[in-house]
């Protein structure tokens, strides 16, 4: 059953039995402010009316502080993440304070027991931080709460439970079983802090949800739909882990909201920008790459405080490794004819060419189907910054190139076997930079050649900056 | 795949120890929690504890913390569960199985070990 | 402890029939109830966790649902080789408890 607790919230940890010759029992919930970024060195602990610590250990009241909140644990020790987490926040912020809360004991139990010890250390924390607001210069403002998985809605707890507002909550993938669809009291949600951003990167529509899938912050950022993270399939994992299993993806998945907070701090000149869209296909269809309206943030640590009426979910593509940064194009293509599309859809490839680099070959993605007389619209991506973009190569895929093509193909031969060449025919492409904002027409290198069909390709050159729309507000965001 | 192989059928005497083990392969040794079932004759399940590899940690079930001891071989990739001061009571099929986080579920199990107490 | 309660000990139904097996807890479990079937050589298998989730490699007949305290594992089309003991179990906390089993038989 739940773990019972003291008045203080205190516990022995029956995981360890404490030496017959010990005779004080260790406090279920430590505050360890880490003075060093080398893991191995102890730091102080803080403890509710102890001044001495602050003291000793050079407790900055006017600078930020930091409390990390780890989640359940089936090891019952401090993975690797939050070492990285507490370095790089020192090495973002070096006079700012940062606090490990260690609920090791409460957390190294049955997943559901931990949970139910979560509303606890919420508490602890919160008495932690009424003692500091006694002090002279402290600030509950410059405060931020950093949770991971279970950790976000102690943090949250913690947000609730506190006698005024804390500055920032961050949730990274806050858990989801046992929170998902829960009253905002008992998970994490926009009134336990001004400012409440939530990184989501372990969703899943079947199985169990590892990371809840509801939206509970001000900005709730799910990169790569919040799902299938690049770099955690059961191949890439399977490479450099032996016996490689559906947990290493799961702790991939769910590790990789750390491993972008990280990054955020660490490599503060590439800052990943996330684009608000009601959903994850719609941004694949590459229709919200604007940053009007406050439409587009920064992700993790350089994230401006949004305070919208109403949830804002964002989205966007990240790398499979740090840096994580990608740069995000919308293409809008005008297919004006069609000609014996039949019943498949073309497969196109396009390669940008830019002042600074050109693109891989790169696949345009169709969500649903390609509409004839009308405008298509597609999200593409590349890893690295290919400066002003000068041409656009768009490749349609020859049928021999896929067997599923192949096969469908040689079905529409036998329906209609008389079936005519396959072409489609395109005038201009719009090109629009997520991270720029800068709109640009490319217009077919021969203005009588338009027309594309299987195993063809055609060119496109920069014709005319913008769409003859009004310009739109950049993104380049206010770095705290 | 995902293999748990056990030790086999023991006939014990009242009184005495007997260590079952339970062999791993397959999955990350120390990854993953394993348990430890027992199922009397033609009756249902009860869970007796767990040993996780990774860090030696254990959690057993009051009604067998003074009957049942887990321990591990890392290197072997084994679990060991010792039952002591045997009785009839304790004559039962007894299944290790590897726990699956977060859903607390017992994913994988091994085909059981029967051991029989007579003298 | 949370005792878990399956009502029907045995139950014959025909090949191609429904069946429906129920299984009670003494308390809310929030959802953390799994499923395993016991074959007659004493394999055991989990078939269905967190209510209603399918293991992998499980036919689809087999499905799961309920809430708080009720929970049943329904089998759409009996298959020969669905004969075998079917036991629940909660996951929700320690000691983990399952039920007593329910025998299902070809009529």
């Known amino acids: 059953s739940p773990v019972p607790f003291g008045p203080e919230g205190r516990l022995e940890d029956k995981l360890h039995k404490p030496k017959a010759t010990q005779t004080e029992v260790k406090p279920s919930v430590r505050f360890n402010l880490r003075t060093s970024k080398d893991p191995e060195h102890e730091g102080c602990y803080l403890s509710v009316g102890h001044s001495q610590p602050l003291e000793d250990c050079s407790f900055n009241m006017t600078a930020k502080t930091f409390f990390i909140i780890h989640g359940w644990t089936m090891s019952g020790i401090f993975e690797n993440w939050l070492h990285k987490l507490v370095s790089a926040l020192h090495t973002r912020e070096k006079d700012a304070n940062v606090v490990v809360v260690d609920w090791l004991p409460l957390a190294h139990q049955l997943y559901t027991d931990a949970v139910n010890n979560t509303r606890v250390v919420g508490h602890s924390i919160a008495r932690m931080l009424d003692w500091l607001q006694e002090k002279d210069d402290f600030s509950l403002g410059n405060v931020h709460l950093i949770g991971y998985s279970l950790g976000a809605h102690v943090a949250g707890y913690a947000g609730n439970f506190v006698k005024g507002t804390v500055g920032r909550i961050t949730g990274l993938d806050p858990a989801g079983p046992m929170f998902e669809g829960a009253d905002i009291h008992k998970r994490l949600s926009p009134d336990d802090a001004d400012f409440v951003d939530v990184l989501h990167t372990y969703t899943r529509s079947f199985g169990l949800s590892i990371g809840i899938q509801m939206p509970v912050g001000h900005i709730d950022i799910y990169p790569n739909g919040g799902d299938f993270q690049p770099g955690c399939g059961l191949n890439d994992v399977l490479g450099s882990i032996a016996y490689g299993t559906i947990t290493e993806v799961v702790k991939c998945e769910h590790e990789r909201a750390v491993h972008l907070f990280v990054d955020s701090l660490v490599n503060q000149d590439k800052p990943s920008f996330a684009f608000q869209c009601t959903d994850s296909n719609r941004f694949k269809k590459g229709i919200c790459l604007s940053c009007r309206k406050n439409r587009c943030n920064s992700i993790g640590y350089n994230a401006k405080k949004m305070r919208n009426k109403r949830n804002s979910k964002m989205y966007l593509k990240t790398r499979a490794g740090m840096p994580f940064r990608v740069y995000h194009y919308q293409m809008k293509i005008h297919v004006f004819s069609y000609k014996n599309m039949g019943e498949i859809e073309p497969t196109f490839y396009v390669t940008l060419y830019g002042t600074n680099a050109d693109s891989q070959t790169l696949p345009l993605e169709i969500v649903e189907r390609i509409e004839q007389n009308a405008t298509n619209t597609f999200l593409v991506y590349t890893e690295e910054d290919l400066g002003d973009l000068l041409k656009i190569q768009l490749t349609w895929e020859g049928a021999s190139q896929s067997w599923y093509n192949l096969w469908k193909e040689f079905r529409s031969y036998l329906s209609q076997p008389r079936n005519p060449g396959r072409e489609l025919n395109i005038r201009r492409i719009r090109v629009k930079s997520g991270e720029t904002q800068r709109k640009l027409t490319f217009c077919t290198e021969d203005p009588e050649n338009t027309s594309i069909s299987p195993g063809r390709e055609l060119w496109f050159r920069k014709c005319r900056d913008g769409w003859r729309m009004k310009n739109e507000t950049s993104p380049t965001v206010e770095l705290p | 795949q995902v293999q748990l192989q056990q030790s086999g059928a023991e006939l014990v005497k009242p009184g005495a120890s007997v260590r079952l083990s339970c062999k791993a392969s397959g999955y990350t040794f120390t990854k993953y929690t394993i348990h430890w079932v027992k199922q009397r004759s033609g009756q249902g399940l009860e869970w007796i504890g767990w040993f996780y590899p990774g860090s030696d940690s254990i959690k057993y079930n009051e009604k067998f913390k003074d009957k049942a001891t887990l321990t591990a071989d890392k290197s072997s990739r084994t679990v060991y569960m010792e039952l002591s001061r045997l009785t009839s009571e304790d004559s039962a099929v007894y299944f290790c199985a590897r726990h699956e986080e977060y859903t607390n579920s017992l994913a994988y199990w091994g085909q059981g070990t029967l051991v029989t107490v007579s003298a | 402890d949370i005792q878990m309660t399956q009502t029907t000990s045995s139950l014959s139904a025909s090949l191609g029939d429904r069946v429906t097996i129920s299984c009670r807890a003494s308390?809310?479990?929030?959802?953390?109830l799994n499923w395993y079937q016991q074959q007659p050589d004493g394999t055991v298998k989990l078939l269905i966790y967190?209510?209603?989730r399918l293991h992998s490699g499980v036919p689809s007949r087999f499905s799961g649902s309920g809430s708080g305290t009720d929970y049943s594992l329904t089998i759409s089309n009996l298959e020969q080789e669905d004969i075998a003991t079917y036991f629940c179990q909660q996951g929700y906390t320690l000691p983990w408890t399952f039920g007593g089993g329910t025998n299902l038989e070809i009529k």
């Open positions: 308390q809310d479990i929030s959802n953390y």
């Open positions: 967190y209510t209603s």
